[in-house]
Interface confidence: medium
């Protein structure tokens, strides 16, 4: 066995093993997505997190899982069976994914102001329509999760929620905000989380009440709600995690480039090996 053949064999099995790993990973992701879709309650108790945007994540996980499994399967079978068409398709898919990531990166860096504004507009709409439309629960769950995780409330200020007529206090009642705005670690007073489902929400019946992230809490005068708006919270989060984000993106990009190089190398050199083998026969 020549050096070239052993090198190709090594590449072949390397591609196979790594893609097998990604195939398993993809199927796990897909299973998680399906689990959430089928049985939310058991997943929530398993994860033990409040305000998880399950509706969006279930679909994101399922689609990501299928996509990862698909690409990994192409790499696995293509490498193991030495099928040029599958390896070519695998390379093409990775190239497409890589190009998409590069394009996104360029768009994010050049269109930052527009992206920020678009995000603000989406958040504003979510805040203004909060609790009124059963179809909008995915966006609401996601925003609740952001507020809960980043320990912030509203976009600019917590008072952004007061603009929403449905959440406005009537008469001398306190203003209301979603419960995800509450800093639970700042108080041990359980009465402060006096959950209020407004009359306007009650007409939505079970749908509005079934998910705890839609719970609305009264704001006492000296309430323990997060004082910071999420615009600042997101900026801080991005600033603090910039190295990690860039590192992950670079890592994923390099991994893709590596697999693309190996697959095209294997694809191009399969012919030479077959020709040589044919001569020896």
């Amino acid at each position: 066995m020549s050096a070239q053949e052993s090198c190709l064999s090594l590449i072949k099995y390397f591609l196979f093993v790594f893609n097998l790993f990604f195939f398993v990973l993809g199927s796990l992701i897909f299973c998680f997505g399906i689990w959430i879709l089928i049985d939310k309650t058991s997943f929530v108790s398993f994860v033990g997190l409040a305000f998880v945007p399950l509706q969006i994540w279930s679909k994101v996980l399922a689609i990501s899982g299928i996509f990862t499994m698909g690409i990994a399967l192409l790499g696995c079978v293509g490498a193991l069976k030495e099928l040029r068409c599958l390896l070519g398709l695998y390379f093409g898919m990775l190239l497409l994914l890589f190009a998409t990531q590069i394009t996104l990166g360029i768009l994010i860096s050049t269109q930052r102001a527009q992206l920020e504004r678009s995000l603000r507009d989406v958040v504003e709409k979510t805040i203004q329509k909060y609790g009124t439309n059963p179809e909008e629960t995915a966006a609401e769950e996601s925003w609740d999760y952001v507020q809960f995780q980043l320990r912030c409330c509203g976009w600019h200020y917590p008072q952004d929620w007061f603009q929403v007529l449905i959440l406005r206090g009537n008469g001398s009642e306190a203003h209301r905000v979603p419960c995800s705005c509450y800093n639970l670690s700042a108080t041990n007073d359980s009465t402060i989380l006096d959950k209020v489902i407004l009359p306007q929400l009650s007409r939505l019946g079970h749908l509005a009440r079934s998910r705890h992230s839609a719970d609305i809490c009264a704001v006492p005068a000296e309430s323990h709600i997060y004082r910071e708006g999420c615009a600042q919270g997101l900026q801080k989060w991005l600033h603090n995690n910039l190295i990690s984000i860039v590192g992950i993106c670079l890592g994923v990009g390099l991994l893709e480039l590596g697999f693309m190089t190996l697959s095209i190398f294997l694809c191009r050199n399969l012919d030479h090996v077959y020709n040589r083998l044919a001569r020896y026969r």
Partner: antibody, heavy 119, light 107 residues
């Protein structure tokens, strides 16, 4: 930190025009509306209008519509108010102030620009 | 236009006093009321928004309350730096309107 720095005092003749600038720093300029408020000597504050720097959309107080024009230069993070056909009753301090939305409080203010209309 | 009527127009008080300024709207403004403090030669400063929420960095002695058409600003214990003019404003509907101001003076 958030800062709104306005142009210096102006003395103009009746019938003339004046353009007051307000340079913003310390925040994302297009993310906040810019309000303009008038305060004539010894008078209450008067809301003139606001502009959304992101798309240039303006909302005016009918009292000032036609004589006040709000504009922005997003590249310079600067808002402007142009007052035309000036009269003696336009003598006042003009403030710019930022607000997260149209129907909201003005959380940061410029130092004010005194415009004196005198012949 | 919604009229905002402040009372009193001026008041004298001493350091340590509890002071209440009221603002009456000509129609229901649904808690869309701010309070501003202005010192001579200075620009106004936001104290309270949405009728009862203190702005960042505003001392806890300042509090706001009210609903419908009646709103109040209370200073629980006057400090020397609190002597200024106070304005209420409605942002419920355009044109946004301010009260005529309440001048708080040292007795």
């Amino acid at each position: 930190q958030v800062q709104l720095v306005q142009s210096g005092a102006e003395v103009v003749k009746p019938g003339a025009s004046v353009k007051v600038s307000c340079k913003a720093s310390g925040y994302s300029f297009t993310d906040y509306n810019m309000y303009w408020v008038k305060q004539a000597p010894g008078q209450r504050l008067e809301w003139m209008g606001y502009i959304d720097p992101y798309n240039g959309d303006t909302t005016y107080n009918q009292k000032f519509k036609g004589r006040a024009t709000l504009t922005v230069d997003t590249s310079a993070s600067t808002a402007y108010i142009e007052l035309s056909s000036l009269r003696s009753e336009d003598t006042a301090v003009y403030y710019c102030a930022r607000s997260p939305y149209g129907h909201y409080a003005m959380d940061y203010w410029g130092q004010g620009t005194l415009v004196t209309v005198s012949s | 236009d919604i009229q905002m009527t402040q009372s009193p127009s001026s008041l004298s008080a001493s350091v340590g006093d509890r002071v209440t300024i009221t603002c009456k709207a000509s129609q229901d403004v649904s808690t869309a009321v701010d309070w501003y403090q202005q010192k001579p030669g200075k620009s106004p400063k936001l104290l309270i928004n949405w009728a009862s929420t203190r702005h960042t960095g505003v001392p806890s002695r300042f509090s706001g309350s009210g609903s419908g058409t009646d709103y109040t600003l209370t200073i629980s214990s006057l400090q020397p730096e609190d002597f200024a003019t106070y304005y209420c404003r409605q942002h419920y509907s355009t044109p946004f309107t301010f009260g005529q101001g309440t001048k708080l003076e040292i007795k």
